[in-house]
């Protein structure tokens, strides 16, 4: 439960987060699990600990192993494990399965490919993107923030996409690459004014205070691949990103699904540890394409049930 798998390439930066969460003020100690030797915090070391993060700048194959992190609050020590594997750089262009992050699927018109793990690093735009080791060039490819946008996607755009960026640590630069597969669904079709499948307009969802809940915003935009089709959540008419409540997050990226030939997109709003004040918010599912915008509102209410003691 408190162990996390991480991997990287030799001579690249690798940053790993302790799987035990705590307050930012908590002290986190890192150890080599095999020797119980403490990992230094001084940044002059190639491998050093920095709070919740363990940094390999750069990584070596010999760094592979299990690392122990101990999150020390004033009252408890909580232990987690990071299982790190550093691989040798491949001589050819082939990226083995064990170096691949999760596969993403896209539509034929417009797709996003997110660069995995990038949020752990101190990087500056733009990202470099490669497909099957070839640098991507042309106006169809747009490196935007932490993702790649491909316009007018075609079936032969499927393949392995690698993002490359520079991590900066105290003025020193380190390269990082991460690869994931991209698949394309090939369909011809048409677009319609968005139809929101979920939630129903003015729906009320019963939730347990203190529990986690997910709200799915799902809409269909026509048949086949769509040029512009987006769904998103708003809270009281504001973007999620403008609403400073870390418990409420919209999942990164959007799932494209094809239901009965229809192109449908959904995004999930995850609310952790539902609070009383969450019941006062208005949750708007917005679906937008070239035809226009449709909005469905959902509210949360407290689940009523009898207690047996």
């Amino acid at each position: 439960k408190f162990s996390k798998q991480s991997w990287g390439l030799e001579n690249e930066a690798l940053i790993v987060r302790c799987p035990r969460q705590g307050k930012s003020s908590y002290i986190v100690d890192w150890y080599y699990s095999q020797t119980n030797k403490s990992i230094p915090t001084q940044e002059r070391n190639r491998v050093f600990a920095s709070g919740q993060l363990l940094k390999f700048l750069p990584a070596e194959v010999a760094d592979s192993g299990i690392y122990t992190c101990i999150v020390r609050s004033p009252t408890f020590n909580r232990t987690g494990y990071a299982n790190v594997t550093i691989y040798k750089k491949q001589p050819d262009c082939n990226v083995p399965d064990y170096l691949m992050y999760s596969t993403v699927s896209g539509s034929e018109k417009n797709s996003k490919i997110y660069c995995p793990t990038i949020d752990l690093y101190n990087w500056t735009a733009p990202l470099e993107w490669f497909k099957n080791c070839q640098a991507l060039q042309g106006s169809r490819y747009k490196a935007h923030k932490s993702f790649l946008v491909i316009d007018n996607v075609m079936t032969d755009d499927a393949g392995d996409y690698t993002c490359k960026f520079i991590h900066n640590e105290n003025g020193a630069n380190y390269s990082v690459t991460a690869t994931r597969s991209f698949t394309v669904k090939d369909e011809q079709g048409f677009s319609l004014f968005p139809v929101i499948r979920a939630p129903a307009h003015n729906e009320t969802k019963e939730v347990e205070i203190g529990e986690n809940t997910n709200l799915t915003c799902s809409a269909c935009f026509g048949k086949g691949a769509q040029f512009l089709a987006t769904v998103q959540w708003q809270l009281n008419g504001n973007k999620i990103t403008d609403f400073s409540e870390p418990r409420i997050q919209q999942e990164e990226g959007q799932n494209q699904s094809f239901s009965n030939g229809l192109a449908c997109v959904n995004t999930v709003l995850r609310i952790a540890d539902v609070k009383e004040e969450d019941l006062l918010l208005r949750y708007d599912c917005l679906a937008l394409n070239l035809h226009g915008l449709r909005r469905h509102t959902i509210r949360l209410s407290r689940k009523h049930h009898h207690h047996h003691h």
Partner: antibody, heavy 117, light 106 residues
Framework: EVQLVQSGAEVKKPGATVKISCKVS????????MHWVQQAPGKGLEWMGR????????EYAEKFQGRVTITADTSTDTAYMELSSLRSEDTAVYYC??????????WGQGTLVTVSS | DIQLTQSPSFLSASVGDRVTITCITN??????IHWYQQKPGKAPKLLIY???TLRPGVPSRFSGSGSGTEFTLTISSLQPEDFATYYC????????FGQGTKLEIK
Amino acid sequence: EVQLVQSGAEVKKPGATVKISCKVSAFNIKDDYMHWVQQAPGKGLEWMGRIDPAIGNTEYAEKFQGRVTITADTSTDTAYMELSSLRSEDTAVYYCATGDFYAMAYWGQGTLVTVSS
Amino acid sequence: DIQLTQSPSFLSASVGDRVTITCITNTDIDDVIHWYQQKPGKAPKLLIYEGNTLRPGVPSRFSGSGSGTEFTLTISSLQPEDFATYYCLQSDNMLTFGQGTKLEIK
């Protein structure tokens, strides 16, 4: 040594509100979480909720949701638990306890609240 | 909701006995379980956290074991000061105490 000193016993009428304080010494209240636990006479322990005093985030057990408010004053290292709409079954000893997100390590001496008409 | 079933509710034993208290959950919570001791009129005292980690200052006759859904607190050789009520606490999802086990002198 970490000490948590709670305010004295209270007698309240049904429908009233009680506010109990918990002063922490030899410890910075911002550095950890503060929990509150109820224990009715002759009964077991019941977790009421917790606060992260550094940022004011609170979480409450469903049983007490809507009636309990946990606050903290970091300038005086004091936590507070307010329970409203009191009823006779709220007669209990209330404990504050400091710990991390998951558990309590140091406890106050307890405050007896009696709800009686 | 995670339910905790603590057993037995009452336990009579003698000084020197080995006793075991069990806490069973209705869902797998790995080792996010803690054990407390409470004496009459006193605040609870933490003995063991995360299944088997002994709190500093707690005698080594106390031990915790188990994972998943079944956890046990064992006192290897009862001492007079161990007669008290014991509670398990789960913190996998919010926090919930077990019903308690009152350990009495036989």
